[in-house]
């Protein structure tokens, strides 16, 4: 039961995470104009991975796509690539994990196949989450670097008479969405990997059978060598059920979800 719950929860958490990664990738507010130096501006700028927007006080908003591919900074291209890779891996992971869910019966799929699929999807979710976190972090680092560079030469002018306020950009909402979503996908992936261990079919546990040989009695237990040497299935602390073996201390602890405020 704990395995099914862990797998199901891992799937749901990953699903939310991947939805968040998609949302963050599509969002326009990766970087927003820093109003600290010009709080009275009637024009507000913000930028995404795919376009930049300007919102006037009236609510009038104008967005322009980055129609060039070669003219864009390499870092931006790298962030785009990381986010897309994250989405693709996450989507494939979701597809695989649907078929791997213990609560879903597809034909006569064996537990070993489901265990492998659960592990595969879990790894995909982990990589997907890492891609998203890496992408967002690279962009954030780029923003911090540019922020301090523009702060260094904030005002330029002709003899100090004419002021040109350079637009500085700070973290946008998409960065926080991306970090949280990446983290959730990562957590979901870890949970899937944990669930995989419980799903993996154990070596069949037979009850001890006595074989009476002529002369003296020997109690023979299959797998006794393996059990004693520590290889294969360890029967210690196991309850035998018809459906296979489960450890009594197989209790999962789920990480708590912290929402960004």
């Amino acid at each position: 039961m704990a395995v099914t719950a862990c797998q199901g929860l891992g799937f749901v958490v990953s699903l939310i995470g991947i939805a968040g990664i998609i949302a963050a990738t599509c969002m326009d507010q990766w970087s927003t104009q820093d109003l600290y130096n010009n709080p009275v501006t009637a024009v507000f700028n913000y930028q995404g991975l795919w376009r930049s927007c300007v919102r006037e006080s009236s609510g009038f908003t104008e967005c322009r796509g980055y129609f060039t591919l070669l003219g864009l900074p390499a870092m931006l291209q790298a962030v785009r690539a990381l986010m897309i890779v994250g989405i693709v891996l996450g989507a494939i992971g979701l597809l695989v994990s649907i078929f791997a869910l213990k609560c879903i019966r597809i034909g006569s799929m064996e537990d070993s196949a489901k265990a492998n699929m659960t592990l595969t999807s879990g790894i995909m979710f982990i990589v997907s989450g890492l891609c998203a976190i890496a992408g967002v972090s690279v962009f954030a680092n780029m923003l911090v670097t540019n922020f301090w560079m523009s702060t260094a030469n904030m005002y330029t002018g002709m003899g100090g008479m004419v002021q040109t306020v350079q637009t500085r950009y700070t973290f946008g909402a998409a960065l926080f969405v991306g970090w949280v979503a990446g983290g959730l996908t990562l957590i979901g992936g870890v949970m899937m990997c944990i669930a995989c261990r419980g799903l993996a079919p154990e070596e069949t546990n037979y009850k001890a059978v006595s074989y009476h040989a002529s002369g003296h009695s020997v109690a023979y237990k299959p797998g006794g060598f393996k059990a004693s040497t520590g290889f294969g299935s360890n029967t210690k602390n196991k309850k035998i059920y018809d459906g296979g073996a489960r450890t009594e201390d197989e209790v999962q602890s789920y990480p708590s979800k912290h929402d960004y405020v």
């Epitope: 104009q33 010009n38 009275v40 501006t41 009637a42 024009v43 700028n45 913000y46 930028q47 930049s52 927007c53 300007v54 006037e56 006080s57 009236s58 609510g59 009038f60 104008e62 322009r64 004419v162 002021q163 040109t164 306020v165 350079q166 637009t167």
Partner: antibody, heavy 118, light 113 residues
Framework: QVQLKESGPGLVAPSQSLSITCTVS????????VHWVRQPPGKGLEWLGV???????NYNSALMSRLSISKDNSKSQVFLKMNSLQTYDTAMYYC????????????WGQGTSVTVSS | DIVMTQSPSSLTVTAGEKVTMNCRSI????????????LSWYQQKPGQPPKLLIY???TRESGVPDRFTGSGSGTDFTLTIRSVLDEDLAVYYC?????????FGSGTKLEMK
């Protein structure tokens, strides 16, 4: 068509407060912002403030302490209230619609003349 | 506050002449996000409210004759009337529409000889 009409007291005693109403037609206050601008006799234009479609306001920093702009969307009315009037506040007061794009004022009322005198 | 300076304060012209008036701001009105200059031009005839001619420094408002042209970027702007008519006699104001308060220039008065 788009129309804005200001209505005010005409004459105000010094240190008293001024209330002007701008009644609009041909557009909704839910969609457009309304600016207030004044013009002293024989002088230039002075921007007083604006109330945006969402109800947010921005004021001229020099007048912020004694200026208040509000509106009633259902009645299509915008209100300007100014306290502690002095003789230099004598002017023609205009309300104007925001263009929605460019932060420009595309339609203006005919204005209401306000004289501050005892 | 952004101070807007207009020059000349008055212009005396003859009908059919090309007219140029200037407006300068102490701070750039160019928004880097959309590369637009937040400057507007208004025409005010005697006894009338102002009328919007140009916004975004160079975009003509609908219904405004094409003899009116706005140009410039950053801090220096120009309003040009290609072939002035009697009906163009008015005071012309430029306005900062980039930063609060939306300050106006002192105006350029266009007069006929």
């Amino acid at each position: 068509q788009v129309q804005l009409k200001e209505s005010g007291p005409g004459l105000v005693a010094p240190s008293q407060s001024l209330s002007i109403t701008c009644t609009v037609s041909g557009f909704s206050l839910i969609s457009y912002g309304v600016h207030w601008v004044r013009q002293p006799p024989g002088k230039g234009l002075e921007w007083l403030g604006v109330i945006w479609a969402g109800g947010r306001t921005n004021y001229n920093s020099a007048l912020m302490s004694r200026l208040s702009i509000s509106k009633d969307n259902s009645k299509s009315q915008v209100f300007l209230k100014m306290n502690s009037l002095q003789t230099y506040d004598t002017a023609m007061y205009y309300c104007a619609r925001d263009r929605y794009g460019g932060n420009s004022l595309d339609y203006w009322g005919q204005g209401t003349s306000v004289t501050v005198s005892s | 506050d952004i101070v807007m300076t207009q020059s000349p304060s008055s212009l005396t012209v003859t009908a059919g002449e090309k007219v140029t008036m200037n407006c300068r701001s102490i701070q750039s009105l160019l928004n880097s996000g959309n590369q637009k200059n937040y400057l507007s031009w208004y025409q005010q005839k005697p006894g009338q409210p102002p009328k919007l001619l140009i916004y975004w420094a160079s975009t003509r408002e609908s219904g405004v004759p094409d003899r009116f042209t706005g140009s410039g970027s950053g801090t220096d702007f120009t309003l040009t009337i290609r072939s002035v008519l009697d009906e163009d006699l008015a005071v012309y104001y430029c306005q900062n529409s980039y930063s609060y308060p939306f300050t106006f220039g002192s105006g350029t008065k266009l007069e006929m000889k």
